[in-house]
């Protein structure tokens, strides 16, 4: 494959990274296979700056992460390691809660209203966030 | 690497009580749930009580509520179980565990007079 | 609270056989169900979360499946360290419940 030097359209790039933002809502699973359909992976926010710019352009609204602990230990979807890596969970969270009465506890991270991060049930259709390294080899062959 | 590692069982007079301890470690405590479950010699697996990553919501088996209270130090990566008014249907090993995935090797607890 | 009805409470089976163990929850509990492995004196170990999906680490002759109140745990081809116990855990709500065990034997 080819190496990616610009964004696709309607992709924000910022530092060295293409940014794709929703504006319909999916469960957690279903905006994760959009993101992989498009070559991408669901945004994973590796320091304040990156966590900034991406509430900047979501805006107060809940939106998908690429963090969950559906097997176990929290994850991010690309690998990057969570315990050593960036955090901004609000106060109190995560706390797993099980008392929305939908079954099961809350296994999926969102950015919520004031950016900071919560986990809830990844079957709630909220926004979601792609993300692509620009420097990551396209999966499109290259043009003769 | 994950670690949990239980200490504090022994053997008690019925009526008595133990603290339990789960010092826990290779991980971010104060993202998970942790859970407290026990069997009894030659018996089944029994979940016993379960509290939230932070805020503290905490749940318990019929058998041993208003018995049992079970806590965290999220600063000192501690989970412990306060057990009071001890029965003999008490005695098991007593497993802390990490949400529903990671378990520790457990402690026993004996309760005989 | 959700009782976990698991069967068979025993089996005997050989080296290269597929098992399987059932467990029926007494209502829906969508997917929120995992199987446990218990070596005698050792701590459980999980193999499977969200009633199909493999731990990592645990060989891929271990399956499961199902969702709502039935699922089953299969084991494709025994292997020696096979024989041991087996129980299934729903986490759907509290209090989380465990199957009684099923003891996979020798024949």
């Known amino acids: 494959g080819s190496e990616r030097t610009c964004c696709p359209v309607n992709w924000v790039e910022h530092e060295r990274s293409c940014y794709w933002f929703s504006r319909s809502g999916k469960a957690w699973a279903d905006a994760d296979n959009y993101c992989r359909l498009e070559d991408a992976h669901l945004v994973v926010v590796t320091s304040w700056e990156e966590q900034k710019f991406v509430q900047h352009h979501i805006g107060p609204v809940n939106t998908w992460m690429g963090l969950h602990d559906q097997n176990g230990p929290w994850k991010w979807v690309d690998g990057t390691d969570y315990e050593t890596g960036f955090k901004n969970w609000r106060p109190e969270q995560p706390d797993d809660w099980y008392g929305h009465g939908l079954g099961g506890g809350e296994d999926c991270a969102h950015f919520t209203d004031d950016g900071r991060w919560n986990d809830d049930v990844c079957q709630r259709p909220y926004r979601w966030v792609c993300e692509t390294e620009l420097d990551k080899a396209s999966q499109e062959p290259p043009l003769l | 690497e994950v670690q949990l590692v239980e200490s504090g069982g022994g053997l008690v007079k019925p009526g008595g009580s133990l603290r339990l301890s789960c010092a826990a470690s290779?991980?971010?405590?104060?993202?998970?749930?942790m859970n407290w479950v026990r069997q009894a010699p030659g018996k089944g697996l029994e979940w016993v009580s379960s509290i939230s990553s932070s805020t503290g919501y905490m749940y318990y088996a019929d058998s041993v509520k208003g018995r049992f209270t079970i806590s965290r130090d999220n600063a000192k990566n501690s989970l412990y179980l306060q057990m009071n008014s001890l029965r003999a249907e008490d005695t098991a090993v007593y497993f802390c565990?990490?949400?529903?995935?990671?378990w520790g090797q457990g402690t026993l607890v004996t309760v005989s007079s | 609270d959700i009782q976990m009805t698991q069967s068979p409470s025993s089996l005997s089976a050989s080296v290269g056989d597929r098992v399987t163990i059932t467990c029926r929850a007494s209502q829906d509990i969508r997917n929120d169900l995992g199987w446990y492995q218990q070596k005698p004196g050792k701590a459980p170990k999980r193999l499977i979360y969200a009633a199909s999906s493999l731990q990592n680490g645990v060989p891929s002759r271990f399956s499961g499946s199902g969702s709502g109140t039935e699922f089953t745990l299969t084991i494709s081809s025994l292997q020696p360290e096979d024989f041991t116990t087996y129980y299934c855990l729903q986490h759907n709500s509290f209090p989380w419940t465990f199957g009684q065990g099923t003891k996979v034997e020798i024949k």
């Open positions: 565990a990490r949400d529903k995935d990671y």
């Open positions: 290779g991980f971010t405590f104060s993202s998970y749930r």
